[in-house]
């Protein structure tokens, strides 16, 4: 699934991530904006074999389970193709837990490239949420 | 399954130190987040700090300047520290995973003279 | 610190009853509130997991609801083994906080 601007800003805002841990809902946005341009079927393959799934993008070395990559950690115990469903529950379940740790979101390089330190207000303005 | 299984002293005097040790089986301690929560008499429970897989820890600031969690990947343990202790600090300490998963029994904890 | 205030302290049912505990945060925690399971010298047990997703193991009885500020724990159909006492949890800010629970006791 592709999701509209404000229509991913209301689904995240459901999801309970706008203001966690800190992080407007518009960073969250900005986030998903750049990693997969709002598509939860995205995946990249990196060159050090992992693979990052979802809409936001979530590496597959740390944090999911997709059964081809070495010393996977799988922290959010969970198959990577979770991360693909147009339900993006597991996808911001296993980001709660990353931003948990104390990168915060740093731990996006598209969230810390492209949208740290920006309006990212932006993202969710003109949105009914 | 994973099981986890505090220890320490039972007792503790005012104004030493309490050291409880966290010990987990059936995963590694460095493919999660885990948390210390302890639970007053009177059943108000505190939320105390975790430490993440990265070794990042967060800490509640009512403990901030007394509490120090800290792990030890190869005994797969984790351990917890607080200063300077009052009989306020009496409780029931648990460590738990993170998601609430998993927790061990408990140990109880007194501080007294 | 975010503030969990949690209503009734004590609930007095009869087993077959249906019950909601209810649990409020002092400002908007989205859906990042947990509900948990103590008995007497036991250990917290999760039952709900963000307001509303259903624990692996936890009985269908079970059931949250709510975001924002307000939550609710239902019961359906209350069994002899669901007493206890019954905390929330919010995961929203840190630190971390619980409400002050909910006692479930056999009338």
């Known amino acids: 699934k592709v999701f509209g601007r404000c229509e991913l800003a209301a689904a995240m805002k459901r999801h309970g991530l706008d203001n966690y841990r800190g992080y407007s809902l518009g960073n969250w946005v900005c986030a998903a904006k750049f990693e997969s341009n709002f598509n939860t079927q995205a995946t990249n393959r990196n060159t050090d074999g992992s693979t990052d799934y979802g809409i936001l993008q979530i590496n597959s070395r740390w944090w999911c389970n997709d059964g081809r990559t070495p010393g996977s950690r799988n922290l959010c115990n969970i198959p990577c193709s979770a991360l693909l469903s147009s339900d993006i529950t597991a996808s911001v379940n296993c980001a709660k837990k990353i931003v948990s740790d104390g990168n915060g979101m740093n731990a996006w390089v598209a969230w810390r490239n492209r949208c740290k330190g920006t309006d990212v207000q932006a993202w969710i303005r003109g949105c009914r949420l | 399954e994973v099981q986890l299984q505090e220890s320490g002293p039972s007792l503790v005097k005012p104004s030493q130190t309490l050291s409880l040790t966290c010990s987990v089986t059936?995963?590694?301690?460095?493919?999660?987040?885990w948390s210390w929560i302890r639970k007053f008499p009177g059943n108000k429970l505190e939320y105390m700090g975790y430490i993440s897989y990265s070794g990042s820890t967060f800490y509640n600031p009512s403990l901030k300047s007394r509490i120090s969690i800290t792990r030890d990947t190869f005994k797969n343990q984790l351990y917890l520290q607080l200063n300077s202790v009052t009989t306020e600090d009496t409780a029931t300490y648990y460590c738990a995973e993170y998601d609430g998963t998993y927790w061990g029994q408990g140990t109880t904890v007194t501080v007294h003279h | 610190d975010i503030l969990m205030t949690q209503t009734p302290a004590t609930l007095s049912v009869t087993p077959g009853d249906s019950v909601s505990l209810s649990c409020r945060a002092s400002q908007s925690i989205g859906n990042n509130l947990h509900w948990f399971q103590q008995k007497s010298h036991e250990s917290p047990r999760l039952l709900i997991k963000y307001a509303s997703q259903s624990i692996s193991g936890i009985p269908s009885r079970f059931s949250g609801s709510g975001s924002g500020t307000d939550f609710t724990l239902s019961i359906n159909t209350v069994e002899t083994e669901d007493f206890g006492m019954y905390f929330c949890q919010q995961s929203n800010s840190w630190p971390y906080t619980f409400g002050g629970g909910t006692k479930l006791e056999i009338k």
């Open positions: 059936g995963d590694s301690i460095t493919r999660g987040y």
